[in-house]
Interface confidence: low
């Protein structure tokens, strides 16, 4: 069989969007199965046609309705004949069109008046490709060969740049790159004191707009009154937008405010946020816990606890805890220094202890009081050896 590509030079140049028809002539075979190959891969093309010239002469057509850049390459036709594959001479298809961008200008964020560069690259064919830069609607500079780098000395407001690529086939316009102006960040917001103890406070906040420059750190300033002397200033790297304030004074009113900084500088401070540390739990245990048996039950008494430090705040109520060796146990809260105990089994030993509480919690427990089943009244001291506490 004889194969040859007809009507096509070794190199074929076509404009993008134009139709192309490649012809392949096969002689010496009846109804040959002509396959078209592009760059070594068989072309699956529904526009493949066969026309018989005579019984043993066929022409195959490969029709490309509208060529694209991706259609460019090396084509040949081939047929199977007696278990062997015969191939024709190849044809090189070049697709020309307006320039194709391989690099387009990217959006940037820059400080005011800072120099920056934008890049643009486009290719043919046909070459050469020249680049023209636009700033908004103004052409800046004459055509330059591709690739092109635009050096800008600086901008003072958000500015749009684009490039235009020209070749013999026409022009193509790139995407618009917006060069945003970096600015100081906005003040943080939603500042919340998330956890409080007597000496620590956890703070969280939401960052304001970053001014299109990465936030680097935030400063938490703490005073004992808004605008008063600074007690504490903590600089924290971000994210996360949280901070632990340590070594605060218990039961004290504080105010805090937060600002965040990017490479250009700090944001304004957010509004002051007041908070109060918790006081201390009571330091003393009630003394002289004793019991008096009555016909109706058991009365427990103890001495009133006087606050040792103002940071403890007001004391009271008292919390009473009792347990029996049969497993019965209970707690009760009383306002005074006397409690009437009911619901206990007089046939079993009873162990009682008491603590005084405040807004923070309960202070230390008193010495346990053991009321023996055979006692008429209890005594304070170590529990009976039978009783585990």
């Amino acid at each position: 069989a004889g194969l040859k590509l007809m009507g096509a030079p070794v190199k074929l140049t076509v404009s993008q969007g134009q139709p192309v028809k490649l012809n392949c002539s096969v002689e010496g075979m009846e109804e040959p199965d002509i396959q078209w190959v592009k760059d070594g891969a068989v072309v699956q093309n529904l526009d493949q046609l066969y026309i018989p010239v005579s019984e043993q002469h066929w022409i195959g057509f490969l029709s490309l309705k509208s060529v694209e850049r991706s259609d460019a390459g090396r084509y040949w036709c081939q047929v199977e004949d007696g278990g062997e594959t015969e191939i024709s001479q190849p044809v090189w298809l070049t697709v020309e069109g307006v320039p194709f961008f391989t690099v387009e200008p990217k959006d940037l964020a820059v400080p005011p008046n800072a120099p920056f560069q934008l890049s643009c690259e486009a290719v043919g064919p046909p070459e050469p490709v020249t680049i023209v830069w636009w700033r908004g609607t103004t052409k800046i500079g004459g055509p330059a060969p591709s690739p092109s780098v635009l050096n800008v000395t600086g901008v003072t407001q958000s500015t749009m740049f684009s490039c235009e690529a020209h070749n013999l086939k026409g022009l193509a316009s790139s995407r618009t790159a917006t060069v945003h102006l970096q600015a100081l960040p906005a003040a943080p917001f939603n500042i919340t004191v998330t956890k409080l103890s007597s000496s620590n406070a956890s703070v969280a906040w939401m960052p304001g707009a970053d001014g299109r420059a990465l936030l680097q750190s935030c400063t938490v300033q703490v005073t004992q009154a808004p605008g008063g002397w600074e007690v504490l200033a903590v600089v924290v790297p971000v994210p996360p937008f949280t901070c632990l304030l340590r070594d605060l004074v218990p039961a004290t009113n504080y105010s805090l405010r937060v600002r965040c900084a990017n490479a250009l500088g700090p944001s304004p401070y957010a509004d002051w946020v007041p908070f109060q540390t918790k006081g201390l739990a009571p330091a003393s245990a009630p003394q002289n816990l004793h019991a008096i048996r009555t016909d109706s039950g058991l009365i427990l008494e103890w001495e009133e606890v006087i606050p040792e430090a103002p940071l403890e705040g007001p004391l009271g109520p008292y919390k009473l805890s009792w347990v029996q060796d049969n497993g019965t146990q209970d707690e009760l809260t009383v306002e005074g220094t006397r409690a009437n105990l009911t619901g206990w089994d007089p046939q079993k030993d009873l162990i009682v202890r008491v603590c005084v509480s405040n807004a923070v919690g309960c202070g230390p427990w008193s010495q346990p009081l053991v009321v023996s089943s055979h006692d008429r009244a209890g005594q304070q001291g170590p529990p009976h050896s039978r009783t585990s506490w």
Partner: antibody
Framework: EVQLVQSGADVKKPGASLTISCQAS????????ISWVRQKPGKGLEWMGQ????????NYGPSFQGHVTISADRSTATAYLQWRSLEASDTAMYYC??????????????????WGPGTLVTVSS | SYELTQPPSVSVSPGQTARITCSGD??????AYWYQQKSGQAPVLVIY???KRASGIPERFSGSSSGTMATLTISGAQVEDEADYYC???????????FGGGTKLTVL
């Protein structure tokens, strides 16, 4: 004064072809993108695509690619939106829009300022 | 394809603050724009580049953007602010633009 004058309302049957127009005046037609925005009855705005008349370069929204063709005639400063085969779901108001910024080299205009009055297209059998 | 997500409706009493949100993955890199459309009219630009008020728009309208969320705020909403509001932005590579689904603001 910038003006975008759109063609009148049209009623078509499914399968018919249609071209609606948007004639611009009051500015240099080739310096600005013209975009088309669809609004179905009682529904939201949908960005369809756009053309820069200077280079006849077009961009389409993913759901409109292949279904409509946007073109422009520089000599008459007119942009067109064309359907080869209308469907009932094409029933909508179509706005042509000119961006506020001059973005002659750009791909997407930053934002819209001048809106045409809209062309109501009804596709019904 | 890229999407901008808005709540379908927001209701406020006159004088209250209305907030309409718009979320999209590309909003950290791309500006948000807000349009107001009153019944039977073409849309009107309200806010551009996240936070700039368009000419002729009252000061009670403001915009902000943080991360993937843009917000239109109407401080002291008035009955005449009742309308549909749309956010608008680009997909990350700037290949096409998108409107949000729209939010119907009711000022009761």
């Amino acid at each position: 004064e910038v003006q975008l004058v759109q063609s009148g309302a049209d009623v078509k049957k499914p399968g018919a072809s249609l071209t609606i127009s948007c004639q611009a005046s009051g500015y240099t037609f080739t310096d600005y993108w013209i975009s088309w925005v669809r609004q179905k009855p009682g529904k939201g705005l949908e960005w369809m695509g756009q053309i820069v008349p200077r280079a006849s370069r077009t961009n389409y929204g993913p759901s409109f690619q292949g279904h409509v063709t946007i073109s422009a005639d520089r000599s008459t400063a007119t942009a067109y939106l064309q359907w080869r085969s209308l469907e009932a779901s094409d029933t909508a108001m179509y706005y042509c829009v000119r961006p506020y910024f001059q973005t002659s080299g750009g791909t997407i205009p930053e934002y819209y300022q001048h809106w045409g009055p809209g062309t109501l297209v009804t596709v019904s059998s | 394809s890229y999407e901008l997500t808005q709540p379908p409706s927001v209701s406020v009493s006159p004088g209250q603050t209305a907030r309409i949100t718009c979320s999209g993955d590309a909003l950290p890199k791309k500006y948000a724009y807000w349009y107001q459309q009153k019944s039977g009219q073409a849309p009107v630009l309200v806010i551009y580049e996240d936070e700039k008020r368009a000419s002729g728009i009252p000061e009670r309208f403001s915009g902000s953007s943080s991360g993937t969320m843009a917000t239109l705020t109407i401080s002291g909403a008035q009955v005449e602010d009742e309308a549909d509001y749309y956010c608008y932005s680009q997909e990350r590579n700037g290949n096409y633009a998108v409107f949000g689904g729209g939010t119907k603001l009711t000022v009761l």
